[in-house]
């Protein structure tokens, strides 16, 4: 039902859902810190623009009695319960920040008349694509899928002269929320990825994965998985791997690869890591000092959500436009705003664009090196290392099907 918004007369409120079930196991205190830091920046920016208004955040906590799994499995109802709480208290702000779980976002979007914008740090699944008033500030599954298809088809790079049309996907059900939805998108038979591939099989057991590594009758040399190097080691250990196997490790929210003096372990030599271009150092920031790299991205998305609201508020106020309108609710897309860590671009559907980075392990230096970057905004690949020191034969990525000649 329609809820009156605390969003006029020079006073603008942000409703922040503080859900027990979250895409990342982040103490709510850290998210509060991120939001508060964002508020300080927004107030400064509005003041500098000569806009004398008040911007505050209201943190809406769920009781945590019923929905206490801590992950996203029981988030569907928690989001709706929180919305009911907001509705009963008549405390809706100009914008809703949170939830981060795909289940809850999808359900909330479905079950409410959204005449206000919703900003999410998460909601990675395909079911949250193309939602008119939803903005997602962490790379959704659709962006990953488009990269993979682009990369599979590429055959004109010095280090990749074959297009690929096959893949195994390892998905055992214990994944983190981001990985769960990334792999879910690759698995879905109706997805773009599945549509563009000739062969794709999901490996669900550790043994299935381990057997493929040396199976002469395997149908593809390429295996996609999601997680960090430790996750791969737990699965693969020091097992021998056929020389033309390529493991694509999706580890988007982890900038440990970019830290000084990081050496790639030996088991990473057959692996290409897909991650995001790291932010400028956030370590000096009060909200991020005690966060792991992944959680830093999550907290940063909350902070950027506040900055995005500030950006839109400034534009609408400067133009003398009303904030509590469908126009405002639909405006959080197809734009670039100044985020905490540099410019942030949102696509036509309100999803964050980013630079994805594909890394390889140099056999010479045992260091991670950038092989190529991919700009999700223009769907374009930029090869970086034209002469990579790969483990694969002739320093070229192998064909995806053993024994098949050039195409």
């Amino acid at each position: 039902s329609q809820v009156s918004q605390n969003c006029h007369n020079g006073s603008y409120e942000i409703s922040v859902l503080m859900m027990g079930n979250s895409a990342f196991a982040e103490p709510l205190k850290n998210l509060e810190d991120a939001v508060n830091e964002g508020l300080e920046i927004v107030r400064g920016r509005l003041q500098n623009a000569g806009l004398n208004v008040t911007v505050n955040a209201t943190f809406m906590y769920s009781d945590g009695l019923i929905h206490n799994s801590g992950d996203c499995r029981s988030s569907t109802c928690e989001g709706l319960d929180l919305l009911r709480k907001i509705s009963n208290a008549q405390r809706m702000g100009c914008v809703l920040i949170g939830p981060s779980c795909t289940y809850s976002t999808f359900q909330m979007y479905l079950d409410t008349e959204l005449s206000y914008p919703m900003i999410s740090a998460g909601s990675f699944g395909l079911s949250c694509d193309y939602k008119e008033t939803l903005t997602r500030l962490m790379s959704p599954a659709r962006k990953l899928m488009y990269f993979l298809v682009n990369f599979w088809k590429t055959n004109d790079l010095p280090f990749k002269t074959y297009s690929w049309s096959t893949s195994y996907v390892y998905k055992n059900g214990t994944e983190t929320e981001d990985c769960f939805w990334y792999l879910n998108a690759l698995e879905a038979s109706v997805s773009y990825f599945s549509h563009e591939l000739g062969f794709k099989v999901v490996l669900r057991q550790d043994k299935e994965f381990q057997d493929i590594l040396m199976d002469h009758n395997r149908k593809s040399n390429v295996i996609i998985m999601c997680g960090g190097p430790e996750f791969l080691y737990k699965l693969k250990g020091d097992r021998a791997v056929a020389e033309d196997i390529v493991i694509i490790l999706v580890d988007l929210f982890n900038d440990q690869y970019f830290e000084d003096n990081v050496t790639a372990p030996d088991y990473m030599k057959n692996v290409l890591v897909l991650t995001l271009s790291p932010g400028n150092s956030l370590l000096n920031s009060s909200f991020s000092r005690n966060l792991s790299p992944t959680k830093r991205d999550f907290a940063l998305a909350y902070l950027n959500g506040i900055l995005l609201f500030g950006h839109m508020l400034k534009i609408f106020l400067e133009n003398g436009e009303n904030i509590t309108t469908p126009k405002f609710a639909h405006a959080f897309r197809n734009l670039t705003f100044e985020g905490y860590d540099g410019p942030v671009t949102l696509d036509d559907w309100g999803d964050v664009d980013s630079t994805m980075v594909l890394l390889y392990t140099s056999v010479d230096t045992k260091k991670y090196k950038v092989l190529l970057t991919y700009d999700t905004h223009v769907n374009k690949t930029y090869p970086v290392d034209m002469s990579p020191t790969f483990t694969w034969k002739n320093s070229k990525l192998p064909n995806d099907i053993t024994g098949r000649g050039p195409q």
Partner: antibody
Framework: EVQLVQSGAEVKKPGSSVRVSCKAS????????ISWVRQAPGQGLEWMGG????????NYAQKFQGRVTITADKSTSTAYMELSSLRSEDTAVYYC??????????????WGQGTTVTVSS | QSVLTQPPSVSGAPGQRVTISCTGS?????????VHWYQQFPGTAPKLLIF???NRPSGVPDRFSGSKSGTSASLAITGLQAEDEANYYC????????????FGGGTKLTVL
């Protein structure tokens, strides 16, 4: 305003090496790619290689692979280009240039003043 | 031999319009990569003139414009002035072994 200041002119013997520095001021050094571009007398611009300081590894044009080494010292906001096995055709003005973004495909929007390297016996 | 091909020289009288072409291939301009243009006066460092095919950095007069189509790009200068006499270079990205950053051979613009 961002500025790149390069080290002074060098005269070198064939077979030796030269190391040119490029100090950045007035910006976030790690956030931008640094490229090295050279220009022989009366000739055009030639990209030698570049580095992404936040990542630390360099990439080189095939022509210079094995002969050039590009490094960056984040603590002093300085990039270095070392060219070895010098020959007379390496006589040129060497420029460092900052990309408009982190990656090498960015435009080169800030240039150093250039360092003249003369290779002569 | 430069990866991107430019005419060695072009000329025009003051007030005229001149264009400088930059021809690439399917591995650079034709692959959709942006083209940037630089202006260089003798004895000085190059200066960014046009970026991302057709954008001007602040301070560059709107007499300078860029365009891109297929595997080539061009720089247009209208209302030619004596101070435009300089060398002009195009630059793009390249997917082949010659890459990743490639320049044109340069064009000397003479104002008659």
């Amino acid at each position: 305003e961002v500025q790149l200041v390069q080290s002074g002119a060098e005269v070198k013997k064939p077979g030796s090496s030269v190391r040119v520095s490029c100090k950045a001021s007035g910006g976030t050094f790690s956030s931008y790619a640094i490229s090295w571009v050279r220009q022989a007398p009366g000739q055009g611009l030639e990209w030698m290689g570049g580095i992404i300081p936040i990542f630390g590894t360099a990439n080189y044009a095939q022509k210079f692979q094995g002969r050039v080494t590009i490094t960056a010292d984040k603590s002093t906001s300085t990039a270095y280009m070392e060219l070895s096995s010098l020959r007379s055709e390496d006589t040129a003005v060497y420029y460092c240039a900052r990309g408009g973004g982190r990656w090498l495909h960015s435009r080169l929007d800030v240039w150093g003043q250039g360092t003249t390297v003369t290779v002569s016996s | 031999q430069s990866v991107l091909t430019q005419p060695p020289s072009v000329s025009g009288a003051p007030g005229q319009r001149v264009t400088i072409s930059c021809t690439g291939s399917s591995s650079n301009i034709g692959a959709g990569y942006d083209v940037h243009w630089y202006q260089q006066f003798p004895g000085t460092a190059p200066k960014l003139l046009i970026f991302g095919n057709n954008n001007r950095p602040s301070g560059v007069p709107d007499r300078f414009s860029g365009s891109k189509s297929g595997t080539s790009a061009s720089l247009a200068i209208t209302g030619l002035q004596a101070e435009d006499e300089a060398n002009y270079y195009c630059q793009s990205y390249d997917r082949s072994l010659s890459g990743p950053v490639v320049f044109g051979g340069g064009t000397k613009l003479t104002v008659l």
